[in-house]
Interface confidence: medium
């Protein structure tokens, strides 16, 4: 028998520095977690103790903090090289700055293979990107070889900016021939490493003949065997065992997100490359693990530029940006409109001639808007200003919901109106009218939404049975502020870009902004 140790991360999302337990900015260092310096300590400890170790990343290193905003992927290549990752799969967010923003800082600089079998380049891009990412890679590990085959969410064109010269194929269809090729090369230990979410990971384990282990990402799935060490609630045991269609037991793993855990999976193979046993657990990277001093000092060196960036002007406002709780928790506020407009703008993807865009709607809890911005400071808007407005380090995600769920959400928005509570929704691409004289749960008297399948966008009444795409904060997608109906009833959820980054990019693009209060939210019966 031959033992392999798989160390894995996924959805790190720019958390190069240690973070608080909820993966936001580290405040009390003695209770902080993760970060590449701490990760390196643990990885080195395992490499020294065990003979056959692979360090893998399942995608979405890009996007999530000011590190990515400033360094645009150079920081990913640098620190992944420093940690000596063995392979990485492309995630959807790796395309956030277009194909060029992937090629130059990451693909050309990584000292490890970057993989995806279901992304095919065409046209002029085919020769430019040739060899910079691969469908699979055979890695020597000790006296054996291990094949790693990559995959990426086929929804990437709707979630990011891969352009028109990359085709995202069905994962299972694309993986099978590559695995077959590995088999003909006499590679009998094969890991599928990819970024399509836990449901697809399980399908790959079930359907793709010859895959021995699946290491996934995208859905931020936390798996654990035994008592979990932090706040995350396991979605199943680690590893999650799938019985394949040809009768094999295939371990599937994922390691939550944000570099909080290091996935640790031990696999035992027989001489024919069959998995005899698999066991492990994610390792919580808490403060009991010291940060490596060399990597930490390197982080501090790279940090300096971030502090300078946060005070530079992104753009100007010529109006007061009203982000006060007195406004945003009670009525339409222009800060809410600005943020929602930025959220929609960030999701412009012309992937189908029938649609002007794939999504037109935005909802945003008023309680998530934490500060106004005064225009009397020469109109200047900085990253620092935006960090005061959106201090929680969240993301603006894409969900699919039925109209009936949206209606419930808007009823929840005003079910206890007047108490300055955070659930009051700010909107984009939506016209809502409330009648507060009616009883809670029956206060939405009009709900019109902007069409997407139209050449001239206009507002039509919400249809209860229709499925709509909506951009909203991850906080709401996870049921925050009491929006349990969103969490329970959403049909699809894809995590998006860092909230501040979305707004800062929009302001930089617009240069001068002047958002108005324009009647997106109205109150009837003269009560407001």
């Amino acid at each position: 028998a031959w033992e392999l140790t798989i160390l894995h991360t996924n959805d790190v999302h720019s958390r190069l520095e240690q973070t608080s337990e909820d993966s936001s900015k580290c405040v009390n260092a003695s209770r902080c977690m993760g970060g590449v310096a701490r990760l390196f300590t643990k990885v080195q400890q395992i490499r020294r103790a065990e003979p056959n170790v692979l360090l893998l990343d399942a995608g979405d290193q890009y996007q999530g903090t000011i590190w990515f905003t400033v360094y645009k992927g150079a920081e990913v290549a640098h620190f992944m090289n420093a940690l000596r990752y063995d392979a990485m799969a492309l995630g959807n967010h790796e395309f956030d700055n277009g194909v060029e923003g992937l090629i130059e800082p990451l693909l050309k600089e990584a000292k490890f293979p970057i993989l995806s079998a279901n992304i095919k380049a065409k046209g002029p891009l085919a020769s430019q990107i040739s060899g910079l990412y691969l469908p699979y890679k055979v890695l020597p590990v000790g006296d054996e070889v291990v094949g790693i085959v990559g995959y990426t969410s086929k929804e990437t064109p709707f979630l990011s900016n891969p352009g028109t010269n990359l085709v995202f194929e069905d994962e299972i269809t694309a993986l099978q021939p590559e695995v077959d090729k590995l088999k003909t090369l006499n590679v009998n230990k094969i890991i599928a490493l990819g970024h399509s979410g836990f449901e697809m990971d399980k399908l790959i384990a079930q359907k793709v003949r010859g895959v021995d282990v699946v290491v996934g990402g995208h859905s931020n799935t936390f798996l654990y065997t035994g008592n979990p060490p932090s706040k995350e609630v396991p979605a199943g045991k680690y590893p999650f065992i799938v019985t394949s269609d040809d009768g094999r037991k295939v371990p599937v793993v994922q390691a939550y997100a944000f570099g909080k855990y290091l996935g640790y999976l031990k696999i035992e193979f027989d001489e024919r490359g069959n998995v005899i046993s698999s066991h492990g657990n994610p390792i919580l990277l808490n403060s009991s693990i010291p940060e490596d001093p060399s990597i930490k000092a390197d982080i501090n060196k790279w940090r300096i530029k971030l502090d300078n960036y946060s005070t530079q002007e992104l753009g100007k406002t010529i109006v007061y940006l009203d982000g006060s709780s007195q406004s945003c928790r009670f009525r339409e506020c222009n800060m809410g409109n600005l943020i929602c407009d930025a959220m929609i703008n960030n999701n412009l993807r012309h992937t189908d001639e029938m649609f002007w865009n794939h999504v037109s709607m935005c909802i945003l809890n008023g309680g998530g808007i934490r500060s106004p911005i005064d225009e009397r400071n020469n109109g200047t808007i900085t990253w620092e200003n935006l960090a005061a407005v959106l201090p929680f380090g969240g993301t603006f995600d894409l969900v699919q919901l039925k109209g009936s769920t949206l209606k419930k959400a808007f009823e929840h928005s005003v079910h206890r109106y007047g108490q300055s509570t955070g659930e009051f929704l700010q909107v984009g691409g939506i016209h809502v009218v409330y009648d507060l004289s009616r009883k809670p749960g029956d206060r939405v008297v009009k709900l019109d939404v902007l069409c997407t399948k139209c050449r001239v966008p206009s507002y039509d009444p919400l249809k209860m049975d229709e499925v709509y795409k909506v951009i909203l904060p991850n906080f709401l997608a996870n049921g925050g502020d009491g929006f349990q109906m969103i969490k329970d009833e959403l049909l699809r959820h894809d995590s998006g870009d860092q909230d501040i980054n979305v707004v800062s990019t929009y302001i930089s693009k617009m240069k001068v902004i002047y958002p108005a209060v324009e009647g997106r939210i109205k109150f009837s019966t003269g009560s407001h």
Partner: antibody, heavy 119, light 108 residues
Framework: QVQLVQSGAEVKRPGSSVKVSCKAS????????ISWVRQAPGQGLEWMGG????????NYAQKFQGRVTITADESTSTAYMELSSLRSEDTAVYYC????????????WGQGTTVTVSS | SYVLTQPPSVSVTPGKTARIACGGN??????VSWYQQKPGQAPVLVIF???DRPSGISERFSGSNSGNTATLTISRVEAGDEADYYC???????????FGGGTKLTVL
């Protein structure tokens, strides 16, 4: 394949300055650590200082502080090392070397530039 | 400032194993690189990250680092291995790169 090509040999008078260049080709320049290392005849390797161009600021070994200036021009992927107030003990081969970071090891070295200080 | 100490010379017969030590206070907390330098040539990295070999370096070269000592081990020594060997660390406290004094390996 990354290469570092250094400028040619120099003969200098005591008290003068010398500026050695190191041009990188075949890879990204800005986020890598460029170190300058010298070796006097029959002696060991001595680190003078280094720069990571993306940050702009260099750091110097205490021994050379105030006498050495290390700069980088990102547009031409070239690093420079200038040593002033030369004395005969500065006669040495001067190397530039590149690594992911200072702790990562210097994976690529220039061919070396001989600087002779003589009156 | 931080100091790395190496023996000035080590001798070994062909086919045998050479071990070159590098000493420093709590050296295991730092990351050690090793360089080989032949007369008239630029140094060549043979070990980085304590134990890793760059591509193109023979597997006869290996490294270890624990306590106050790092060791470069060259197994089945060949005449072509005769060279000066330098250990190197980065001292994160001073932000300085430190080289050991070098060890001359003689193949008898």
């Amino acid at each position: 394949q990354v290469q570092l090509v250094q400028s040619g040999a120099e003969v200098k008078r005591p008290g003068s300055s010398v500026k050695v260049s190191c041009k990188a080709s075949g890879g990204t320049f800005s986020s890598y650590a460029i170190s300058w290392v010298r070796q006097a005849p029959g002696q060991g390797l001595e680190w003078m200082g280094g720069i990571i161009p993306i940050f702009g600021t260099a750091n110097y070994a205490q021994k050379f502080q105030g006498r050495v200036t290390i700069t980088a021009d990102e547009s031409t992927s070239t690093a420079y090392m200038e040593l002033s107030s030369l004395r005969s003990e500065d006669t040495a081969v001067y190397y530039c070397a590149r690594g992911v970071s200072y702790y990562y090891g210097m994976h690529v070295w220039g061919q070396g530039t001989t600087v002779t200080v003589s009156s | 400032s931080y100091v790395l100490t190496q023996p000035p010379s080590v001798s070994v017969t062909p086919g045998k194993t050479a071990r070159i030590a590098c000493g420093g206070n709590n050296l295991e907390s730092k990351i050690v690189s090793w360089y080989q330098q032949k007369p008239g040539q630029a140094p060549v990295l043979v070990i980085f990250y304590d134990t890793d070999r760059p591509s193109g370096i023979s597997e006869r070269f290996s490294g270890s680092n624990s306590g106050n000592t790092a060791t470069l081990t060259i197994s089945r020594v060949e005449a072509g291995d005769e060279a000066d060997y330098y250990c190197q660390v980065w001292d994160s406290n001073s932000d300085h790169v430190i080289f050991g004094g070098g060890t001359k390996l003689t193949v008898l």
